[in-house]
């Protein structure tokens, strides 16, 4: 048969952050090419990344159609010069991916502190509401639009002059915290989805400190 030197893909892995979703697999092809198909549990298979020598395929456009659906992908292997060729059972070799539910499993990207503003003994810290590739009515939704109150942010803050940290939570993108007048503070935030069992927390944002560009001070 024409598939004697064709090997099935393996280690199929979903890599997804803020719904940007790529399927990766092995091995690097030698005299073979790959095509990927994706479907929901009840839907039809859709082919992507036709006859590619890559070992990854960006499936974002498919999964953002409904991020709460559960998806399955499969990777077909074909001989490089003869993509019409099939395996011994009359089917090309393929391997299934694990199931993937974007809403429950996409990693939360590192958040960014957009700004902070001090008014007297209060500081308003605002977290950037990152745009995703999820669309509704032809507009891209933000992370908050997609997750709503399921997404919270944890703020860590501390006086620049000491190591003792404090924390606060919000299910919006804003914190209003009490500070000591005349003290400079540093801030870092983390995104969390409490209801999840996997990929629950993001990495911490870069630290931002008062007395630097992002801040504003009003008496």
């Amino acid at each position: 048969s024409g598939t004697t030197n064709t090997v099935a893909a393996y280690n199929l892995t979903w890599k997804s952050t803020n719904f940007k979703t790529i399927l990766e697999w092995e091995p690097k092809p030698v005299n073979q090419v790959y095509t990927v198909q994706i479907s929901t549990k009840s839907g039809d298979w859709k082919s992507k990344c036709f006859y590619t020598t890559d070992t990854e395929c960006d499936l974002t456009d498919e999964i953002v159609k409904d991020v709460k659906q559960t998806y399955l992908a499969r990777v077909f292997s074909y001989p490089a010069g003869n993509v019409e060729s099939t395996g011994s059972a009359g089917e090309p070799l393929y391997e299934n991916s694990p199931e993937f539910t974007p809403y429950l499993e996409t990693n939360l990207g590192q958040p960014t502190i957009q700004s902070f503003e001090q008014v007297g003994t209060k500081v308003n810290v605002t977290v950037e509401d990152e745009r995703t590739l999820v669309r509704r009515n032809n507009t891209f939704l933000s992370l908050r639009d997609v997750f709503g109150k399921d997404l919270i942010y944890t703020l860590y803050y501390w006086k620049s002059s000491s190591s003792g940290k404090k924390t606060a939570k919000t299910n919006t993108n804003e914190f209003l915290i009490d500070v000591d007048k005349g003290e400079n503070y540093c801030f870092s935030v983390q995104a969390v989805i409490p209801s999840r069992t996997v990929n629950r927390k993001s990495t911490d944002s870069p630290v931002e400190c008062m007395g630097q560009e992002k801040g504003e001070f009003r008496e």
């Epitope: 404090k166 924390t167 939570k169 299910n171 915290i177 409490p194 209801s195 069992t197 629950r200 927390k201």
Partner: antibody, heavy 117, light 107 residues
Framework: EVQLVESGGGLVQPGGSLRLSCAAS????????MHWVRQAPGKGLEWVGW????????IYDPKFQDRFTISADTSKNTAYLQMNSLRAEDTAVYYC??????????WGQGTLVTVSS | DIQMTQSPSSLSASVGDRVTITCKAS??????LSWYQQKPGKAPKLLIY???SLADGVPSRFSGSGSGTDFTLTISSLQPEDFATYYC?????????FGQGTKVEIK
């Protein structure tokens, strides 16, 4: 099955030190926040502090900041409470608890620390 | 720091009674409040989170209400297994603080 098991409690003299352990099973501690809460005999619950085991961030009630240190070893799936300069008023049952960021859903059975000469 | 004032500190009630326990925060904590039940010699058990959401496996006779500074735990019809001490916890900002507890005793 999710389980938290505290150990390391016992009798210690005033001024002494003790390290409590909270061994977790059934989940990965780095995916959650881990807290220590204590309860003096016949009294209410008192929050001690938390750790995010993934990045080592710790938060304490200021009254414990100078004497207590929370740490975690993700390879052992265990959180720790190091207590120094212990006083009679630190006598309590010490609990560890898992925090989803919305609530403390699992608690250990507690370990009794008695500070007495 | 946020103070949580819980009342009453104790109450006597009979099986079937409706019981209400309140917690007042010294400032706005939005809905970052949970309620726990503790029996002697045991660890606390989660009842209510986000002020109003019933935790998994908790009987529907327990309910929570409130947001901002005023919160209530209600047991609609007290059962024998409900005699215990109840605590509120604010976790909106550190230091997290518990209420002083309410001991529900048999009348």
């Amino acid at each position: 099955e999710v389980q938290l098991v505290e150990s390391g409690g016992g009798l210690v003299q005033p001024g002494g030190s003790l390290r409590l352990s909270c061994a977790a099973s059934g989940f990965n501690i780095k995916d959650y926040y881990m807290h220590w809460v204590r309860q003096a005999p016949g009294k209410g619950l008192e929050w001690v502090g938390w750790i995010d085991p993934e990045n080592g961030n710790t938060i304490y009630d200021p009254k414990f900041q100078d004497r207590f240190t929370i740490s975690a070893d993700t390879s052992k799936n265990t959180a720790y409470l190091q207590m120094n300069s212990l006083r009679a008023e630190d006598t309590a049952v010490y609990y560890c608890a898992r925090d989803t960021a919305a609530y403390f859903d699992y608690w250990g059975q507690g370990t009794l620390v008695t500070v007495s000469s | 720091d946020i103070q949580m004032t819980q009342s009453p500190s104790s109450l006597s009630a009979s099986v079937g009674d409706r019981v209400t326990i309140t917690c007042k925060a010294s400032r706005d904590i939005k809905s970052y409040l949970s309620w726990y039940q503790q029996k002697p010699g045991k660890a606390p058990k989660l009842l209510i989170y986000y002020a109003t959401s019933l935790a998994d496996g908790v009987p529907s006779r327990f309910s929570g209400s409130g947001s901002g500074t005023d919160f209530t735990l209600t047991i609609s019809s007290l059962q024998p297994e409900d005699f215990a001490t109840y605590y509120c916890l604010q976790h909106g900002e550190s230091p997290f603080t518990f209420g002083q507890g309410t001991k529900v005793e048999i009348k």
